[in-house]
Interface confidence: medium
C-alpha cells in the first residue's frame, strides 16, 4: 500500500483581521494509527495550534467530524483571526508510540497573512512657524497594516507633491507594518488658508484611502508690511498720521510708536480686519499737536509680530511746515494725541 | 551521532545543484535539521529548518532560491539557479532534545563553488 | 528581517582575562530566551557553547557563561585561555520560524 500523504492544498490564504481562516488538511490513508496536530512554524519554535487528541484550542473548531471511524479530513477552522496569527501552519500526521507518539509526516504548509487596516494617518508639522519662501517638512505616520504593501501620496491643496521620502518599517517579515513619511513644502504668502493631506491606499480600504490632514495656518507665518501716511490737517497745528499693517498671520500683534525715538504708545492689535486669504490688516493712528514741537519729528512705527524682532516704518514731520504764533500765551496742548479708529 | 554533508563541487551558474546531508547513529521522536552556509572570510547564514515529519520553511531571502526535503535518509538541500553569490560552504546541523532552537551537531560541511 | 547585532566586532584579551560579547536582537527572541552561542575555529564547523540564552552545552567548560533576555544577551568568557582564540557567534529563534546569527566576534588570546 502506498505511503500516507498529508495534503496542504493551499499553499497560502490571505484573510482579514477578525475574520476566520480555514486551514484544509487531508490524508491519503488511514494507516498508520496515530493522531493529527497543527502547528504554526517548522522549527524547534513551532507553536502548537491543535491537538487532535488532547488540550484546550478555544479559537480553533475542526471542520469534519474526527470522531467518525474514516475520517481523512483534518482542517480547522481559527477564529477571530488577528495580525498575531501570521504564519506557515502545518499539518503534521503523528504515528502511535508508547510513550510518546512519533512524528511521521508533515504536510507542505499553508502560509496565513492577516490583512489589517492601516490606523488613520497623523499628520505633523514642524515645531516652530516659518515664512513664505521656506521649505518646511511634514511628517505621516501609520501603523498595523498588514500586507506589507501600500501607498502614499502627499498634496497640498489637491495638488500632488513629489518631493518625500517614505518607509515601511519592518523590512522583513512581521506581523504588521508600520509607514513613516516625510514631506518638504515650500510656503507662499497665499497659504494661510492651505491644507497638507497624507493619503494611504492599501488593498483593506478596498479603494477608499485614508487620508490624515494638517493645516498651513499652525505653520505659516506672514510677516506684516508696514505703511507710514500723514493725513490732511484735521485741525489748526494737529495732523493725523496713520501705520498700516497689512497682510500678517497669524494674529498675535504689539505696535508701538515712538517720537524721535523715545517710546510715545504702545498698543495691542485688536479689531482686525480679514483678507481673503485668510490674512489681517490693522490700521494705527496718531494725532500730532505741531505746535508743541519746535524741530521737526521722527515718527517711527514699531511693530512686533508673533514673537518675532520688530519691524519698524518712520515718517518724517517737518515742523517748519507749520508756522506757530507769535506771542501766544496759550499753554500748548499735549505734543501728541492718539486715537484708535472707530 | 553525527551529521554529514555531501555533493559540494565546481558548478555553473544557473545548474541546479542539490547537496545531501545525512544522519547517523540517531533513533529519536523528534528532530530537525537546518542549512547553514558560510561564504569564505564571512559569517554564517541560516538558509532554513525541515522538522522530522517533513515540513520545511525557510529565511526570507532565501524562499524561492533553496528548497530543503525529506528522504528516508537523507535531508537535502536544491540550490535551484546558483549565482556566484551561493560560492559558500554549506553546513547542515540538528536540532533535537531541548526547545531553544539550538543546532546541537553540526556536519564539517561541504564546499560549493559557483563560477564559470 | 530579524537582526542580530554582535559588539565588537574584535576583542582582544590576555590569557586568565575576561572577554564580554554583546548580542542585541531587533526584536524579542521567541520565548525571550531562544538565543544560542557558538564557537568557530577556522576550517571547522561550529561549535555549540550556550543554547536557552544561558544553559551550558553539554561538555562545554564553566568559564563560558550566557545571560540576558528578550533583545539583549551577553556572553562572558573568564579565565582566558589560548584555546579559546576563536570567532564566536550568536543566534536567534523567532516566532516567524526563522534561526539567524550574529555578524561574529573575533578573540583573539595574548
Known amino acids: 500500500e502506498e505511503e500516507l500523504q498529508v495534503i496542504q492544498p493551499d499553499k497560502s490564504i490571505s484573510v482579514a483581521a477578525g475574520e476566520s481562516a480555514t486551514l484544509h488538511c487531508t490524508v491519503t490513508s488511514l494507516i498508520p494509527v496515530g493522531p493529527i496536530q497543527w502547528f504554526r512554524g517548522a522549527g524547534p519554535g513551532r507553536e502548537l495550534i491543535y491537538n487532535q487528541k488532547e488540550g484546550h484550542f478555544p479559537r480553533v473548531t475542526t471542520v469534519s467530524d474526527l470522531t467518525k471511524r474514516n475520517n481523512m479530513d483534518f482542517s480547522i477552522r481559527i477564529s477571530n483571526i488577528t495580525p498575531a496569527d501570521a504564519g506557515t501552519y502545518y499539518c503534521v500526521k503523528f504515528r502511535k508510540g508508547s510513550p510518546d507518539h512519533v512524528e511521521f509526516k508533515s504536510g507542505a504548509g499553508t502560509e496565513l497573512s492577516v490583512r489589517a487596516k492601516p490606523s488613520a494617518p497623523v499628520v505633523s508639522g514642524p515645531a516652530a512657524r516659518a515664512t513664505p519662501q521656506h521649505t518646511v517638512s511634514f511628517t505621516c505616520e501609520s501603523h498595523g497594516f498588514s500586507p506589507r504593501d501600500i501607498t502614499l501620496k502627499w498634496f497640498k491643496n489637491g495638488n500632488e507633491l513629489s518631493d518625500f521620502q517614505t518607509n515601511v518599517d519592518p523590512a522583513g517579515d512581521s506581523v504588521s507594518y508600520s509607514i513613516h513619511s516625510t514631506a518638504k513644502v515650500v510656503l507662499t504668502r497665499e497659504d494661510v488658508h492651505s491644507q497638507v493631506i497624507c493619503e494611504v491606499a492599501h488593498v483593506t480600504l478596498q479603494g477608499d484611502p485614508l487620508r490624515g490632514t494638517a493645516n498651513l495656518s499652525e505653520t505659516i507665518r506672514v510677516p506684516p508690511t508696514l505703511e507710514v501716511t500723514q493725513q490732511p490737517v484735521r485741525a489748526e497745528n494737529q495732523v493725523n498720521v496713520t501705520c498700516q499693517v497689512r497682510k500678517f498671520y497669524p494674529q498675535r500683534l504689539q505696535l508701538t510708536w515712538l517720537e524721535n525715538g523715545n517710546v510715545s504708545r504702545t498698543e495691542t492689535a485688536s479689531t482686525l480686519t480679514e483678507n481673503k486669504d485668510g490674512t489681517y490688516n490693522w490700521m494705527s493712528w496718531l494725532l500730532v499737536n505741531v505746535s508743541a514741537h519746535r524741530d521737526d519729528v521722527k515718527l517711527t512705527c514699531q511693530v512686533e509680530h508673533d514673537g518675532q524682532p520688530a519691524v519698524s516704518k518712520s515718517h518724517d514731520l517737518k515742523v517748519s511746515a507749520h508756522p506757530k504764533e507769535q506771542g501766544s500765551n496759550t499753554a500748548p496742548g499735549p505734543a501728541l494725541a492718539s486715537a484708535a479708529p472707530l | 551521532q553525527s551529521v554529514e554533508e555531501s555533493g559540494g563541487r565546481l558548478v555553473t551558474p544557473g545548474t541546479p545543484l542539490t547537496l545531501a546531508c545525512t544522519v547517523s547513529?540517531?533513533?529519536?521522536?523528534?528532530?530537525?535539521i537546518s542549512w547553514v552556509r558560510q561564504a569564505p572570510e564571512k559569517g554564517l547564514e541560516y538558509i532554513g529548518i525541515?522538522?522530522?515529519?517533513?515540513g520545511a520553511s525557510y529565511a526570507s531571502w532565501a524562499k524561492g532560491r533553496f528548497t530543503i526535503s525529506k528522504t528516508s535518509t537523507t535531508v537535502d538541500l536544491k540550490i535551484t539557479s546558483p549565482t556566484p553569490e551561493d560560492t559558500a560552504t554549506y553546513f547542515c546541523?540538528?536540532?533535537?532534545?531541548?526547545?531553544?532552537?539550538?543546532?546541537?551537531?553540526w556536519g564539517p560541511g561541504t564546499l560549493v563553488t559557483v563560477s564559470l | 528581517a530579524q537582526v542580530l547585532t554582535q559588539t565588537p566586532a574584535s576583542v582582544s584579551a590576555a590569557v586568565g582575562g575576561t572577554v564580554t560579547i554583546s548580542c542585541q536582537s531587533s526584536?524579542?527572541?521567541?520565548?525571550?530566551?531562544?538565543l544560542s552561542w557558538y564557537q568557530q575555529k577556522p576550517g571547522k564547523p561550529p561549535k555549540l557553547l550556550i543554547y536557552?540564552?544561558?544553559t551550558l552545552a553539554s561538555g562545554v567548560p564553566s568559564r563560558f557563561k550566557g545571560s540576558g533576555s528578550g533583545t539583549q544577551f551577553t556572553l562572558t568568557i573568564s579565565d582566558l585561555e589560548s584555546d579559546d582564540a576563536a570567532t564566536y557567534f550568536c543566534?536567534?529563534?523567532?516566532?516567524?520560524?526563522?534561526?539567524?546569527f550574529g555578524g561574529g566576534t573575533e578573540v583573539v588570546v595574548k
Open positions: 536557552g540564552a544561558s
Open positions: 525541515i522538522n522530522i515529519g517533513g
Open positions: 543566534q536567534g529563534g523567532y516566532r516567524t520560524d526563522i534561526y539567524p
Open positions: 547513529g540517531f533513533s529519536l521522536i523528534s528532530y530537525y
Open positions: 526584536e524579542s527572541v521567541y520565548k525571550n530566551n531562544f
Open positions: 546541523a540538528m536540532s533535537y532534545g531541548m526547545d531553544t532552537g539550538a543546532f546541537n551537531i
